[in-house]
């Protein structure tokens, strides 16, 4: 079955604003795919769970992007 | 082995500024939070601040929110408490320590998670001592 | 005045268990975790409790903590005169974003 070309992406809108690191609940990074052209870093906010996309090419996400690929490159067989 | 050592204390006159220094060794400086915190004479424990160096961003007890400023340089796995004007009630010994750990799960799958761990602060620095005086 | 509560002193004969508490409130103990830290005469502090009730490798298995609603407990069982320290409590604030002490337990060994 021929994949999809539709683009969906999870992120609608992407919030510029700094989160503090003491209100995440956890980042989840959704890489660049068929269905979505662009990485996606989606942030759950430890009250009341709300989500929020950062902006993948701020210097906070770039540095924790680069900190990922540093670990799966370390674990990967 | 895994270390945090502080720097730059001392006698300082009231009015002047100063910085302290916190190196880091031993462990991935950008994969935790560094925290500053003091001990006045006689007196207990007391939390300062904090920075997470992989995103730059500092919190400061309301106390001191204002009076000082937390940084750190990624480059060099340091992390700074500076003044720009001294009080005789900043007399403290001053210790940094490690807290926050950012913890990648689900690594080798489409989805890796973030999470940042604070488990308490397990790794000090030895202290170093400012004493603000005329 | 610090915002966690703790007894100023405490006290035991070797081999004796005791216990130090720590008083709080719902912005702080009550929605986190706790954790001790022992203060040697002219040493840095060092954690001895994290999350509650859990100790880091190196800690002898004589500390242990507990956590109840507002308040948490570190209990010294098979007290050593190497024990004679200070003592602290903390965890974070909701209401004040940030960390909080207790004011210290000086604990002797008799």
């Known amino acids: 079955v021929p994949l999809s070309r539709t683009v969906r992406c999870t992120c609608i809108s992407i919030s510029n604003q700094p989160v503090n690191p003491r209100s995440l609940e956890k980042l989840e990074i959704i890489p660049a795919s068929q269905f979505c052209p662009r990485v996606e870093i989606i942030a759950t906010m430890k009250k009341k769970g709300e989500k929020r996309c950062l902006n993948p090419e701020s210097k906070a996400i770039k540095n924790l992007l680069k900190a990922v690929s540093k670990e799966r490159s370390k674990r990967s067989p | 082995q895994v270390q945090l050592v502080e720097s730059g204390g001392g006698v300082v006159q009231p009015g002047r500024s100063l910085r302290l220094s916190c190196a880091a060794s031993?462990?991935?400086?950008?994969?935790?939070?560094i925290t500053w915190i003091r001990q006045p004479p006689g007196k207990g424990l007391e939390w300062i601040g904090e920075?997470?160096?992989?995103?730059?961003?500092?919190n400061y007890a309301q106390k001191f929110q204002g009076q000082v400023t937390i940084s750190a340089d990624k480059s060099i796995s340091t992390a700074y408490l500076q003044w720009s004007s001294l009080k005789a009630s900043d007399t403290a010994m001053y210790y940094c320590?490690?807290?926050?750990?950012?913890?990648?799960?689900?690594?080798?799958?489409?989805?890796?998670?973030?999470?940042?761990?604070?488990?308490?602060?397990?790794?000090w620095g030895q202290g170093t001592l400012v004493t603000v005086s005329s | 005045q610090s915002v966690l509560t703790q007894p100023p002193s405490a006290s035991g004969t070797p081999g004796q268990r005791v216990t130090i508490s720590c008083s709080g409130s719902?912005?702080?103990?009550?929605?986190?975790?706790v954790n001790w830290y022992q203060r040697l005469p002219g040493a840095a502090p060092q954690l001895l409790i994290y999350?509650?009730?859990q100790r880091p490798s190196g800690i002898p298995d004589r500390f242990s903590g507990s956590k109840s609603g507002t308040s948490g407990s570190l209990v010294i069982s098979g007290l050593q005169s190497e024990d004679e320290a200070d003592y602290y409590c903390?965890?974070?604030?909701?209401?004040?974003?940030?960390?909080?002490f207790g004011g210290g337990t000086k604990l002797t060994v008799l």
């Open positions: 999350n509650n009730d």
């Open positions: 320590a490690r807290d926050g750990r950012f913890d990648v799960s689900d690594l080798l799958t489409d989805k890796p998670k973030v999470t940042i761990n604070y488990n308490g602060m397990d790794v």
């Open positions: 031993g462990f991935t400086f950008s994969s935790f939070s």
């Open positions: 920075i997470t160096p992989m995103f730059g961003i500092a």
């Open positions: 719902s912005s702080n103990i009550g929605s986190n975790t």
């Open positions: 903390a965890s974070w604030d909701d209401s004040l974003n940030g960390r909080v």
